[in-house]
Interface confidence: medium
Amino acid sequence: APRGTQAEESPFVGNPGNITGARGLTGTLRCQLQVQGEPPEVHWLRDGQILELADSTQTQVPLGEDEQDDWIVVSQLRITSLQLSDTGQYQCLVFLGHQTFVSQPGYVGLEGLPYFLEEPEDRTVAANTPFNLSCQAQGPPEPVDLLWLQDAVPLATAPGHGPQRSLHVPGLNKTSSFSCEAHNAKGVTTSRTATITVLPQQPRNLHLVSRQPTELEVAWTPGLSGIYPLTHCTLQAVLSDDGMGIQAGEPDPPEEPLTSQASVPPHQLRLGSLHPHTPYHIRVACTSSQGPSSWTHWLPVETPEGVPLGPPENISATRNGSQAFVHWQEPRAPLQGTLLGYRLAYQGQDTPEVLMDIGLRQEVTLELQGDGSVSNLTVCVAAYTAAGDGPWSLPVPLEAWRPGQAQPVHQLVKEPSTPAFSWPW
C-alpha cells in the first residue's frame, strides 16, 4: 500500500472524519489539501487499497492569479446506503512530484438493528411431517440472538435460548405461521412471516382390488391431513407406453392421463372405459381445503382379457354332396384380447349338433355323414380368446353349391360319429 514520505510536510490540511450509522445511511467523507502549482488528482483508499470506482468529487480553488500560486483542493467521497462492505479505514492519497502523501485516517462503522441475511420462506408441508426453517441475521453490533415465533407465540423464554439459525419442526397438523426476531444491543428486527400450509400426506399403498376387462377397481390408504378433512382424491390413469413404461416418480406421462375424482371415504375407485388386456399406469393424490397431496408413484396395472364382443362376419356356407365349405371373416367388434381361434357348430333338423375347434383358420371343409342328405343343415361360428367364447353368429343355412362357384379344396374334417359338445340352439 502507498505510504507517505516524511521528507516533506504533508499537504493535507483537512483529514476524513468518522461515520458510524445504521444500514442505509448516507454520508460523506472529506479531505482538503493545499498545494503549489498544478493541483493533483486525489485518490481514496479503504483499508489501504485504492478505490477505483469511488463516488468522489474534487473541487479546486486557486489562491492566486498565477498557475504557480497555491491551490486549495477538496475531495468528497459519498457513501450512499451504508452497508457492511463500506466499513473500514479511509484515507486520501496524492502523488506530488516523486512523492506520495496520504492523509490521516477516518473510520466508517456500521452499528444498528440486526440485518437479516436469511428469513423463513413460505412453504407447503405434509401433515405430521418434520421440516426445518432457516433464519440468519447479523449486526454490528454483535452478538445477534434469535427468537422463533409460531403463530406469534415465542418458542423460547428469551432470545438466544432455543433454536437459532435452524428451527426443526417435528410436524404440524394445521397451517401455521412462523417468524423470527433478531435481537442485539440496538434493539430488535422481526423477519417476514412465513406461512406453512399443511397439505395431506401422500396416499399410501395404492393397489388393485379387482379387475375386469374394461375396468379396474383400485384402493389406497389416505395419508394424515391434520385438522382438515379430505374433500376428495384424484386418480390418474395413463396407457403404458409399450414397454417403455413410466418410471416411479416420473413427473409426466407420455400422454394426457385419464383423470377421475373419488369422493372419500371410501378410499376406493372403479376406473371404467378402459381397454381390455392393456397395461396402464395409475397414481393418486388426495385433497383437503388446504390443497392437494403429492402424487403417489406411478403403479403399473393391467386389465385382463375379455371375450370378443361380436361374432365372426360374412359367414358363407355351401354344400356339394357330402361336403360343406364354410368360411368367414374376423369379427369387426373388438376382440378384447388375443384371438386364439374359432369354434364352429353345425346341426341338421333331426341330428345332434356338433361343435368343432377350427383354430385360427377362417375356413373349413366338412365331410358330412352319408351322402349329405341331412336336411336343413345350419352353421354357427364364434371367436374366442383366453377369456372364453364371444357371441355365436346367427345360424347360417347351408346353400347348395352352384356350378361356377369356387369350391376350394381344403383339408377335410370328418363329422364325428357322436357329438363332441351339445350346444343349446
Epitope: 399410501r204 399403498n205 382390488v209 379387475r211 375386469q212 376387462p213 390408504t221 408413484h297 396395472v301
Partner: antibody, heavy 122, light 107 residues
C-alpha cells in the same frame, strides 16, 4: 434360492401375546409384499392380510382387524405377526407367504414359510 | 367377498391315473386363479397361477384350465408324491379367498 423360515411352535396362555417371525432370504425383501395365512387344524386356508415391505403399510382382512399386527425389521429381512390377547380360537398354524410386487398385492403367493403352530392352553 | 367352492373334499385314485380337481368362484375372477399344494407335513407350494401357468420347478404333469367362474387342476399321470391337499385361490379381488381344499389319496 428363495426361502421363508418361520419361528418355532409357541405355547401360550389365554390373554398372552405371541409374536411370530418370518425371515426371508434369496431375494430383495423390500420388493415383494408379505402375506399372512391362517389354517385351523384339519381346515382350509384363510388369508389374514399383507404388509407392503417397501413402505411398511399393513392391510388386514376384516376378520383380523384389532388384535393382529404385521410389522417388519427390514434390515434383517424379517416380517412379524403379533397376536394380542390370545384365545383358544387362535390355536392354529400361521403361514407367511411372499406375494405382490411393491404396492401391488394381486400376485400369487409363490413361496411359503413352513408354518408356525400356536397352542393356547391354561 | 368372493366364495371359492371345491365340491370334492377328497378323492382316491390309482398311480398313473388322470385326476381332475374342480373349483368354482362365486363371480368372474378374470383368470386370476392359483392352485396350491399342501403336503401331509404341512408345507405349502404354489403349483399353478393365472389358470394354467406352471410355477418354476413344478412337474409338467400338472396343468390347469378354465375361465370365468369354473376352473380345474389336472394331474395327468398320478405319482405317489402327489398325495396332498390341493387348494384353489382367487387373486382377482381383495380379500384373497381359498377353496376348502381337495384331499387326494392313493387307492
Amino acid at each position: 434360492q428363495i426361502q421363508l423360515v418361520q419361528s418355532g411352535p409357541e405355547l401360550k396362555k389365554p390373554g398372552e401375546t405371541v409374536k411370530i417371525s418370518c425371515k426371508a432370504s434369496g431375494y430383495t425383501f423390500t420388493k415383494y409384499g408379505m402375506n399372512w395365512v391362517k389354517q385351523a387344524p384339519g381346515k382350509g386356508l384363510k388369508w389374514m392380510g399383507w404388509i407392503n415391505t417397501y413402505t411398511g403399510e399393513p392391510t388386514y382382512a376384516d376378520d383380523f382387524k384389532g388384535r393382529f399386527a404385521f410389522s417388519l425389521e427390514t434390515s434383517a429381512s424379517t416380517a412379524y405377526l403379533q397376536i394380542n390377547n390370545l384365545t383358544t380360537e387362535d390355536m392354529v398354524t400361521y403361514f407367511c407367504a411372499k406375494g405382490g410386487y411393491y404396492s401391488n398385492p394381486i400376485y400369487p403367493m409363490d413361496y411359503w414359510g413352513q408354518g408356525t403352530s400356536v397352542t393356547v392352553s391354561s | 367377498d368372493i366364495q371359492m367352492t371345491q365340491t370334492t373334499s377328497s378323492l382316491s385314485a390309482s398311480l398313473g391315473d388322470r385326476v381332475t380337481i374342480s373349483c368354482r368362484a362365486s363371480q368372474d375372477i378374470n383368470n386370476y386363479l392359483n392352485w396350491y399344494q399342501q403336503k401331509p407335513d404341512g408345507t405349502v407350494k404354489l403349483l399353478i397361477y393365472y389358470i394354467s401357468r406352471l410355477h418354476s420347478g413344478v412337474p409338467s404333469r400338472f396343468s390347469g384350465s378354465g375361465s370365468g367362474t369354473d376352473y380345474s387342476l389336472t394331474i395327468s399321470n398320478l405319482e405317489l408324491e402327489d398325495v396332498a391337499t390341493y387348494f384353489c385361490q382367487q387373486g382377482n379381488t381383495l380379500p384373497f379367498t381359498f377353496g376348502s381344499g381337495t384331499k387326494l389319496e392313493i387307492k
